[in-house]
């Protein structure tokens, strides 16, 4: 006869480990008992359980309520046991010893490996701003046994670097993702991918990139100066910019306060029916937490009653 077993039994922390010990012999051979023991190089052999053909299962006090036989139907020559709720301390060598008549004793050893799946965490780096050099976007840490694999999944161009720290029964892996921030990265996902044999599928944690920036400001509305004439209704100037965080807009007049009736609505300056009083230099101010910008335009309102007055060239800076 021979013993069928596994050299390595792998189980995830908290699950039940099936320790196989299957005697393949002739039908006239009788299995008297199957003895299970934990084999420790320092502490020697410690009895786990005894499966007796007549008296059933006896579990040693240290493993009470943790060792059992699979339920029937079972092959009478199957000496496998279940070790309930495996913990890291259960990792190590186990031995099953089968006593048969008349063939004698057979023994086999197996290693129990307890996988500890990681619980990854993602930490964003410092606030990203356009114009910075190579900056930490995020770091991702996962600890498990064996050491997990930590990688990044993203369309964003950058560099990743990993380091690991070994502990007595596990290893922590930290991977960092560095990039040169640009506004095109705004809203892009940066995903930390953690692989481990104790996970049914990769774990993914996604961080959405936020890059602070403020674009140059410009003013629209003066493209056709001939439209800016006395009596015209609905004339507007619009300040163009973009930024992250979204910028705030403000309008001023360089040569005095805004004329009465001129309304500021966010990025837009709305005029009442135009008069020559509306002529002047208007400044759009754009700001967010990162920076501020300004753009100015000169408005000249034409008076058809004054044919000597010519159109001045619009200036913008």
């Amino acid at each position: 006869g021979e013993l069928e077993t596994s050299d390595l039994v792998t189980v995830v922390l908290g699950q039940d480990a099936k320790l196989p010990c299957f005697y393949r012999g002739d039908p006239d051979e009788q299995v008297g008992q199957v003895a299970w023991a934990r084999v420790d190089p320092n502490e020697g052999t410690r009895e786990l359980a005894l499966l007796h053909s007549k008296y059933g299962l006896h579990v040693s006090p240290a493993y009470e309520d943790r060792v059992e036989q699979p339920p029937p139907p079972r092959d009478p020559l199957d000496g496998s046991i279940l070790l309930r709720n495996a913990v890291q301390a259960d990792e190590g060598e186990y031995e099953c010893r089968v006593s048969t008549f008349p063939a004698g004793s057979f023994q086999a050893r197996m290693r129990l490996r307890v996988l500890v799946p990681p619980l990854p965490s993602l930490n964003p780096g410092p606030p990203l701003e356009e114009g910075q050099g190579l900056t930490l976007a995020a770091s991702c840490t996962a600890e498990g046994s064996p050491a997990p694999s930590v990688t990044w999944d993203t369309e964003v161009k950058g560099t990743q670097s990993s380091r690991s720290f070994k502990h007595s029964r596990s290893a922590a892996v930290t991977s960092e993702f560095h990039l040169v921030p640009s506004r095109s990265m705004n809203g892009q996902p940066l995903t930390c991918v953690v692989s481990h044999p104790g996970l049914l599928q990769d774990q993914r944690i996604t961080h959405t990139l936020q890059v602070a920036f403020l674009a140059e400001a410009s003013v629209r509305g003066l493209e056709d100066q001939n439209l800016w004439h006395v009596g015209r209704e609905g004339a507007t100037l619009k300040c163009l910019s973009e930024g992250q965080p979204p910028p705030k807009y403000n309008w001023t007049r360089l040569d005095g306060p805004l004329p009465s009736g001129v309304r500021v609505k966010g990025d837009t300056l709305g005029f009442p029916p135009l008069t020559t009083e509306h002529s002047g230099v208007y400044v759009c101010h754009v700001s967010n937490e990162l920076s501020s910008r300004a753009s100015q335009v000169t408005v000249e309102v034409l008076d058809p009653e004054d044919p000597g007055k010519q159109v001045d060239l619009v200036s913008a800076s």
Epitope: K18, R24, D26, P27, P70, D75, P76
Partner: antibody, heavy 118, light 107 residues
Framework: QVQLKQSGPNLVQPSQSLSITCTVS????????AHWVRQSPGKGLEWLGV???????DYNAAFMSRLSITKDNSKSQVFFKMNSLQADDTAIYYC????????????WGQGTSVTVSS | DFQVTQSPASLSASVGETVTITCRTS??????LAWYQQKQGKSPQLLVY???TLADGVPSRFSGSGSGTQYSLKINSLQPEDFGTYYC?????????FGGGTKLEIK
Amino acid sequence: QVQLKQSGPNLVQPSQSLSITCTVSGFSLTTYGAHWVRQSPGKGLEWLGVIWRGGSTDYNAAFMSRLSITKDNSKSQVFFKMNSLQADDTAIYYCAKIGYDGYAMDNWGQGTSVTVSS
Amino acid sequence: DFQVTQSPASLSASVGETVTITCRTSENIHNYLAWYQQKQGKSPQLLVYNAKTLADGVPSRFSGSGSGTQYSLKINSLQPEDFGTYYCQHFWSSPWTFGGGTKLEIK
């Protein structure tokens, strides 16, 4: 190589018994036991019972009262007998060798198609 | 009563695709699970035993995984000969029931 050849009737009268013989080659019944499984028309598979290498048996409780599985190691034969067949016992009956793990069915017979009808 | 729930009941896929079939059991079966393939008019064939171990002669594109009450059979890069019906079976407590089957058809 491993083979399981089944022989038995294709037609059984209601209330009569069904006997099927499974003759094996390529392995010994003293080393590997055998399962019996059936498959009803258009339905899935149903486990009926097992005979272990040592000769002991375990049956699906739903069939225990009318099922018997025995074997003759020297002739390499496993015998299946089911009593009191009814129309809903119409099925393909399979014998299958127990695999290396001691439970799964790693080789199957060709099946015996049995109709229960008068 | 002990339940084995296999899903999906049917699946349509193309050659080269990857498919996954799952089996859920009503209690922990500790990896005492096998997967079989059956083609029309033929006897079933063992693919995987002990939830994860590939049977002799089974191509490596088949793989079994899972633990506790949830198990999967994955077929990478489907080949024409892979089409048929797939069954899981547990060997935990009597009776050793089969899943209802998954019919895998060519798209």
